[in-house]
């Protein structure tokens, strides 16, 4: 039975040209995290494998940095980066947990962080 929950940074906004940290946290389970995938819609951004470490997709190599922790830092943001981002936790023995973050990249200098929320 899957008992864990993923807490994410929720709906967030950031300025064009700036950077943002995408963060998820898996709690309420003793399952072992074997891999965390970060995806934007259907595109793979990065993967952190528990044994081998981080792999950054070549197309994002210059704009994505691993961490902090299992999070992901997006740099040199453009308005095209606006959209849904998913953290996918592969665990044993529970299976897969998915968290969702919506990022809005703003032209203006007003960029407020949304509240955190949980996905069971």
């Amino acid at each position: 039975m899957m008992t864990g929950t993923i807490e994410t940074t929720g709906n967030i906004s950031a300025e064009k040209g700036g950077s943002i940290i995408l963060q998820c946290h898996l709690s309420s389970t003793t399952a072992q995290v074997t891999q965390v995938n970060w995806e934007q819609q259907d595109q793979l951004l990065a993967i952190c494998n528990a044994d081998l470490g981080w792999h950054i997709s070549p197309s994002f190599k210059d704009r994505v940095a691993p961490g902090p922790g299992l999070g992901l830092t997006l740099q040199s943001l453009t308005v095209n980066d606006t959209g849904e981002y998913f953290c996918i936790y592969h665990t044993y023995p529970d299976g897969t947990y998915t968290g969702r973050i919506f990022l809005e990249v703003l032209e203006s200098s007003v960029a407020e962080h949304g509240a955190r929320f949980q996905i069971p």
């Epitope: 891999q35 494998n49 044994d51 081998l52 470490g53 190599k61």
Partner: antibody, heavy 128, light 108 residues
Framework: EVQLVESGGGLVQPGGSLRLSCAAS????????MDWVRQAPGKGLEWVGR??????????EYAASVKGRFTISRDDSKNSLYLQMNSLKTEDTAVYYC???????????????????WGQGTTVTVSS | EIVLTQSPGTLSLSPGERATLSCRAS???????LAWYQQKPGQAPRLLIY???SRATGIPDRFSGSGSGTDFTLTISRLEPEDFAVYYC?????????FGGGTKVEIK
Amino acid sequence: EVQLVESGGGLVQPGGSLRLSCAASGFTFSDHYMDWVRQAPGKGLEWVGRTRNKANSYTTEYAASVKGRFTISRDDSKNSLYLQMNSLKTEDTAVYYCARGQYYYGSSSRGYYYMDVWGQGTTVTVSS
Amino acid sequence: EIVLTQSPGTLSLSPGERATLSCRASQSVSSSYLAWYQQKPGQAPRLLIYGASSRATGIPDRFSGSGSGTDFTLTISRLEPEDFAVYYCQQAVPSPLTFGGGTKVEIK
């Protein structure tokens, strides 16, 4: 041409130290994981350890048999990999190879790790 | 750590024959992290197969790999004189990376 060339092997007494070098050329060194693998005379291959790439802050990991005695480092500005071997034992006698690790993900997030480029090896003999 | 057991230890065959080499893992491994290498006397190992079944660049199609879970196979469909060598399997996940003990393919 993608190439790896090891150097620094030789004869050393038990308890002694030795530093091996591996010079890389023909590829973007900082992007790659680098492994050390050894082969004792007449025996099979044994993984010694690795250093990860720049994106992984060059973290290292080691086989249990060498942990605490061997240290892997790299200098990306010189395209060079190193293996510092301390407290050497007779059982460390082997040919030491450096190899380029390929770590990536293909379609369907299918991960791969293998060593696709190898040096010619350098011989380390630990004997009194 | 994962122990990879290769069998047979030695395979005595003639050129033109089919060679079937086995690699058995002590526990399940992901096939995508399973590779095969060839090594000739006095030479460094050479990558043959990665991801259990994908041939490395420049490797002839007489070499093929298969398997999943704990059982993997390297097949050489028709042995050429240059194929007589020692073959090693290797797994990378879970850590630590380990090699099998090798199978020597010798001329009968």
